[in-house]
């Protein structure tokens, strides 16, 4: 349309925008690597990263793999979307004993209420069957079909573990706070993944959680607290804090009730491959500090010489002349040095090969 021409020209003159003839509007041009969430984006918020199939864009703006529900005991509850992970849950007739983000690490069959007990709450994907004693006068054969539910076909009674202490010897039949049986907790403990928090003797809907202080009935002010070295993640689950026990890592931020410990490479090193809240591979910082001249800044940097010198010699860190735009040149590799020298003085993990090279010498 002729009347659109001035607007179109003005829009085309702005490199950050383009004119969309279909909608006759000036649209925001998404930066390289970002894709519009609508036909004619108007602002940066209308652009997002495009992740590969089976990945989603997490809150930090990173493409993250969607969880897989391929295990036999899991079913997909929510599909993998551009901005949210696939969500898995235990298949019908089972409940989740050990939760993980967007999925379940351990599914168990719903319990069958033993003789003298009836179903108070049927099992769900998240919770086991809750049993209660049959009312006086109600026979074990069940007066009401509603109170005599059999589990879904194919389910088996949950094994009763050995009682954990004399004090809980009747745990497999006695209801405990809201009908949750300690036997269920004990079963979770007996099959819990190594290193995960235990909740035996601490009835709670979430394994590894307990109130920070006794809560008034019906109060929502109680913060859940995880066991030591676990933190409460955004989904409200207890998650293990990362460990900084590797020799080349130091703790930057401690493990807190609501955030993981954060590790980083020790001084004189740099992170070559990241990991969530940590670094998967630390390497000696490969360029000598300019202010050090020929003297290394520390032992870690002594081991980052560009060519393997005779053992005991200092690296030559003299700068190259600068000419505005300083180009890079072909570079010797540091791999030989790491093999021959650095491993003797630096505790570098050997699980991943270290591939360094530095130039401009």
């Amino acid at each position: 349309f002729p009347q659109d021409r001035p607007f179109e020209d003005t829009c085309r003159g702005n490199p950050g925008h383009y004119y969309d003839k279909a909608v006759r509007r000036c649209c925001y041009r998404c930066p390289t690597g970002l894709f519009p969430t609508q036909q004619c984006p108007q602002r940066p918020a209308d652009c997002r990263k495009q992740c590969e199939p089976d990945y989603y864009l997490d809150e930090a703006g990173r493409c993250t793999a969607c969880v897989s529900c391929s295990r036999d005991d899991l079913v997909e509850k929510m599909p993998c979307a551009w901005n949210s992970s696939r969500v898995c849950e235990c298949q019908p007739g089972m409940f989740c004993a050990v939760s993980v983000v967007n999925s379940c690490a351990r599914c168990f069959f719903h319990s069958v209420c033993p003789a003298g007990m009836i179903v108070k709450f049927p099992g769900t994907a998240q919770k086991n069957t809750v049993c209660e004693p049959a009312s006086p006068g109600v026979s074990p054969a069940c007066a009401s079909p509603e109170n005599c539910k059999e589990p879904s076909s194919g389910t088996i009674p949950q094994a009763k573990p050995t009682p954990v202490s004399p004090a809980t010897s009747n745990a497999s039949t006695m209801p405990l706070r809201g009908g949750t049986r300690l036997a269920q907790e004990a079963a979770s403990k007996l099959t819990r993944a190594p290193g995960s928090p235990s909740s035996v003797g601490r009835p709670s809907s979430d394994p590894g959680l307990s109130p920070t202080q006794p809560c008034p009935q019906g109060s929502g002010d109680c913060r859940k607290q995880c066991e030591p070295d676990y933190y409460l993640d955004e989904a409200g689950r207890c998650t293990a804090c990362v460990s900084c026990s590797r020799d080349d890592l130091v703790e930057k931020t401690p493990c807190a009730w609501n955030s993981s410990r954060i590790c980083e490479c020790r001084p004189g090193m740099i992170c070559a491959t990241s990991a969530t809240n940590s670094c998967a591979r630390c390497v000696p910082y490969p360029i000598c500090a300019a202010e050090t001249g020929t003297k290394p800044q520390d032992m870690a940097e002594k081991d980052t010489t560009f060519e393997a010198p005779p053992v005991g010699t200092q690296p030559d860190c003299s700068p190259t002349p600068e000419n505005g735009e300083a180009p890079a040149s072909t570079s010797p590799t540091l791999s030989s040095l790491v093999d021959s020298q650095a491993s003797k003085t630096l505790p570098i993990p050997t699980s991943a090969p270290i591939a360094l090279s530095s130039t401009g010498k």
Epitope: T273, S274, T320, E322, S329, S358, T359, G360
Partner: nanobody
């Protein structure tokens, strides 16, 4: 927080070349080392290259001989020339400020700027 702006990415065929730029007006470039990191979809953030204020450089073995880092301190810009690109080089490329101090942890991608997407098809 300091803002860096990466640009120059795009979609290319294997064997082709791109030139990435990283710039800012918030400070002068003649002081700190600068680095490029990259993050492929679903993968971790990986160090690619470093350049010191006086032009000394470092390259990861996976890019050595193909990528070239350089800087123009007068223009507050750091460059990364990507030659002989391969599909494995597909990633978002991020510029990082003073990696000696700031990149000891796994947080040097998406820290200062949005990054620039490089897509290499075979």
């Amino acid at each position: 927080q300091m803002q860096l702006v990466e640009s120059g990415g795009g979609s290319v065929q294997a064997g082709e070349t791109l030139r990435l730029s990283c710039t800012t007006s918030a400070f002068t470039f003649d002081g700190p080392d600068m680095a490029w990191y990259r993050q492929a979809p679903g993968n971790e953030c990986v160090l690619v290259s470093i350049i010191s204020a006086d032009g000394r450089t470092y390259y990861a073995d996976s890019v050595k001989g193909r990528f070239t880092i350089s800087r123009d301190n007068a223009k507050n810009t750091v460059f990364l020339n990507l030659n002989s690109l391969q599909p494995e080089d597909t990633a978002v490329y991020y510029c990082a400020l003073d990696p000696r101090k700031n990149c000891r942890g796994g947080y040097c991608c998406a820290n200062w700027g949005p990054g620039t997407q490089v897509t290499v098809s075979s």
